[in-house]
Amino acid sequence: YHGCPSECTCSRASQVECTGARIVAVPTPLPWNAMSLQILNTHITELNESPFLNISALIALRIEKNELSRITPGAFRNLGSLRYLSLANNKLQVLPIGLFQGLDSLESLLLSSNQLLQIQPAHFSQCSNLKELQLHGNHLEYIPDGAFDHLVGLTKLNLGKNSLTHISPRVFQHLGNLQVLRLYENRLTDIPMGTFDGLVNLQELALQQNQIGLLSPGLFHNNHNLQRLYLSNNHISQLPPSVFMQLPQLNRLTLFGNSLKELSPGIFGPMPNLRELWLYDNHISSLPDNVFSNLRQLQVLILSRNQISFISPGAFNGLTELRELSLHTNALQDLDGNVFRMLANLQNISLQNNRLRQLPGNIFANVNGLMAIQLQNNQLENLPLGIFDHLGKLCELRLYDNPWRCDSDILPLRNWLLLNQPRLGTDTVPVCFSPANVRGQSLIIINVNVAVPSVHVPEVPSYPETPWYPDTPSYPDTTSVSSTTELTSPVEDYTDLTTIQVTDDRSVWGMTQAQSG
């Protein structure tokens, strides 16, 4: 096909691919009609003047995963049709000024995973048609004012995984078309008021894994189209009352891994599209009334691994669509009987690893659709009569690792458990803690007469039998609760950031595998 270098493969569709460690320079001659050229995994260390001079029809050029550390300013001369240029995963420390001059059609420029120390306004001043600029995974410490001023059509800018310690409030001011801005994994400690004011079309803002301590009250007030806001793994200790007030399109908000101590009522301003709220790994100690009342469509609320010791009875008001509530690994000792009353659609609740010593009899009264309840590792000695009677869909109930008191008062619970054993799982059954003579024996098979020989055991009405099979004709395996292997964070669905961590039994929320991703 018009001459293909021996080190390359050329396809009928004008695509050329040159790979292999033996390549140390741009192969020649390249087919004049090439529209896509990939130079991957070679030992090319530099690009000299005009190596692509004879392939002016080129639309896409990928020079990735090489040893490239030096580029001559005229390397891309005569590539006026080029729309996509990737120099990702090389060893570039410096970009020559004028390198992209003449690339009038360029829409995507990928410079990620190099060793770039700085960028200057002159670098991109010719790239007025650029829509995507990837600079993540470099060594940038600051972005000078004006660096992006000419990129008025830019829709995606990734500055993640650099060493940025501060951002000028003017650096993004001309990017009115920007839809995605990623600043994750830097060293930002604060973001000046007004930094995002010009980004009226922004849909995603990724600020996770920085060192941000405070958010300015009006930081997001101009970003009415924001849909995804990632603030996890920072040092945020408080949320200004109005910070989330003007984000009506938001459907994803992550705040896990911060230092939040409290949440004020209404802090989550009207967000009719928000489906998930991740607040685990903070220092929250209490939840006031109506704190989530604006989140009418919320389906997943993760509050695990905090220090919550008090939940106001109306804390969950408004969460009528909530399906999953994770409160595990907190400091709860008591729960008000009405605290879950508004959660009519709740399916899974995880309360394990708390200090609960008793539960009110009506705690699950209005939550008829519950499928999974995790109560293991608390300090429960007994449960109120009939607490689970109305839960016809309940198929997973975890009660182990509690100090069950196996006296005559435990009979109703024991009888119900006998009839509903499959719900308890086979791995771990609840065992008696007291009296000492029955310690360690299974609560389900314990002979209470042996446990309390001196007490006459009266006829106690047993918990009515509830068939353990769910109402639905079929029940997919994916809904079974697994608290041992689960995702520690929502998958922030980046094409360039897809790390998912799996942890041990201190994992995040003890909910279903299917839901946790």
Epitope: Q333, R357, N377, Y400, D401, T428, V431, G440, D505
Partner: antibody, heavy 120, light 112 residues
Framework: EVQLVESGGGLVQPGGSLRLSCAVS????????VHWVRQATGKGLEWLGV???????NYNSHLMSRLTISKENAKSSVYLQMNSLRAGDTAMYYC??????????????WGQGTTVTVSS | DIVMTQSPDSLAVSLGERATINCKSS????????????LAWYQQKPGQSPKLLIY???TRESGVPDRFSGSGSGTDFTLTISSLQAEDVAVYYC????????FGGGTKVEIK
Amino acid sequence: EVQLVESGGGLVQPGGSLRLSCAVSGFSLTSYGVHWVRQATGKGLEWLGVIWAGGSTNYNSHLMSRLTISKENAKSSVYLQMNSLRAGDTAMYYCATHMITEDYYGMDYWGQGTTVTVSS
Amino acid sequence: DIVMTQSPDSLAVSLGERATINCKSSQSLLNSRTRKNYLAWYQQKPGQSPKLLIYWASTRESGVPDRFSGSGSGTDFTLTISSLQAEDVAVYYCKQSYNLPTFGGGTKVEIK
């Protein structure tokens, strides 16, 4: 007779890790929880964590990121794994259980302890 | 975390005399529903492992001599040895289990 015997102590380099064992007899780990407590020489007691009969764990919040407690019921052994050791982790490490006390977090049977020294 | 503060650090008492050790918690250890104070006292003799003496602030562990008694509620607790014996020379620790356990710094009891 109820017994708890710790082992695995010794000299560890700063930054290294340790894995201590607690071999129990006279009771089953499927029925009783086991705590780990440490004590620096001449200092007070510090609770590290517990693994309950069903395998749930609780940890000292200050040490949680460096600690893992696990067990093998069939071997009647409980393990304490501690990473990123520093000089301040030098101590006697005890395991203990709640055999007859009515206090769920009470520790009425203790091992004799194993000494860990963190030094270069 | 709940902080436990013991006083005094050390105490010298004559044989047969009363010894009183105080323990203060940074928050209440009383659970209003169970009506229990989640406080325990331990004794540790030189070269030995600790021994549980008292739990729920005032319940003596079986086998513990009745000269040991515990009292108090909420945030202030006391361990009293009504008539000190030679074998009572030890360090005494309070421990809360209202939240995940924390120990006090210890009080050393010696014979005057």
